[in-house]
């Protein structure tokens, strides 16, 4: 999906009002400097591409993020404020339902959400170019 035409300010507002709190809640108990920042993004569409990938694509050691509160709110924000996003996700959602697993917060998931916090932080930068 090409995130170029999203309403970035509306997505930013959704992040600031709710998603950020849900990320904080998920990370509760984690040490501030436990994880290095290794994932980056250069502009807002790129940030959303990386955010979507880390939030919804299962990775080795962390298959359970998509059902977390922050993930569901992220999905809703993208569906509302990114034209055509919902349609591109129908197949992905059906595939995800087939491999749904019990929610387990692993250290790998915490590391992944730490990277997500960094990506959202970059997405929210006021001077970050959109293209």
């Amino acid at each position: 999906y090409d995130f170029t035409n999203c309403d970035f300010e509306k997505i930013k507002a959704a992040y600031l009002s709710t998603i950020s709190k849900d990320l904080i809640t998920y990370m509760s108990g984690t040490k501030s400097t436990e994880f290095n920042n290794t994932v980056s993004c250069s502009n807002r569409p790129h940030c959303l591409t990386e955010i979507q990938s880390l939030t919804f694509n299962p990775t080795a050691g962390c298959a359970s993020l998509a059902k977390e509160m922050f993930a569901m709110k992220t999905k809703a924000a993208l569906a509302i404020w990114c034209p055509g996003y919902s349609e591109t996700q129908i197949n992905a959602t059906q595939a995800m339902k087939k491999r749904r697993k019990r929610k387990v917060t692993t250290n790998k998931c915490l590391e992944q959400v730490s990277q997500l916090q960094g990506l959202w932080r970059r997405f929210n930068r006021p001077l970050l170019k959109q293209q």
Epitope: M27, S32, N37
Partner: antibody, heavy 118, light 107 residues
Framework: QVQLVQSGAEVKKPGASVKVSCKAS????????MHWVRQAPGQRLEWMGE????????DYNQNFRGRVTITVDMSASTAYMELSSLRSEDTAVYYC???????????WGQGTLVTVSS | DIQMTQSPSFLSASVGDRVTITCKAS??????VAWYQQKPGKAPKLLIY???MRHTGVPSRFSGSGSGTEFTLTISSLQPEDFATYYC?????????FGQGTKLEIK
Amino acid sequence: QVQLVQSGAEVKKPGASVKVSCKASGYTFTSYLMHWVRQAPGQRLEWMGEIDPSDSYTDYNQNFRGRVTITVDMSASTAYMELSSLRSEDTAVYYCALTGTINYFDYWGQGTLVTVSS
Amino acid sequence: DIQMTQSPSFLSASVGDRVTITCKASQDVVTAVAWYQQKPGKAPKLLIYWASMRHTGVPSRFSGSGSGTEFTLTISSLQPEDFATYYCQQYSSFTFTFGQGTKLEIK
């Protein structure tokens, strides 16, 4: 182990600028955010701003925006905080402090006293 | 900005006493609260993060609790080295803010 070593005390005239340095060691400099926090005599701690050394992006407390500039010298693993248009109320101890993506401060510099007096 | 209000501002106590310091946030900060101890001429030292987690090396007599808008720091049995100023800080949202401090003095 992580260490943050700051430059020495400064005395400045009102209207002048001051630049405080913070040399980091014991970790990969680009991995974490560097913050500056100040404490005026008898006052609460006040967060001033932060810099991401990986790309030098800064965020500032609006109370200081326009007067504070935070920079880094990657080659020296050093962060700087410059405060301009100094006034007597800027007399304070200035600290650098380190965080990851979660913004509480588990590592602090020793502090730099800046005195603004005519 | 979220305001953090500590009480009391001053507290006199004796060695062996149990003391509690309170911090109230002006809006919900989940559990994103840290507590610091500061002695004269020194940088603050992290005691508690995530409202209730003790930082490495912090004695077990220090404990934190709370969520939402009300938080407490408790020292179960005061030791001579505990007389200092204590600050709470919220890191739930930008800009990060501190309480005004509680100065703990020997009675």
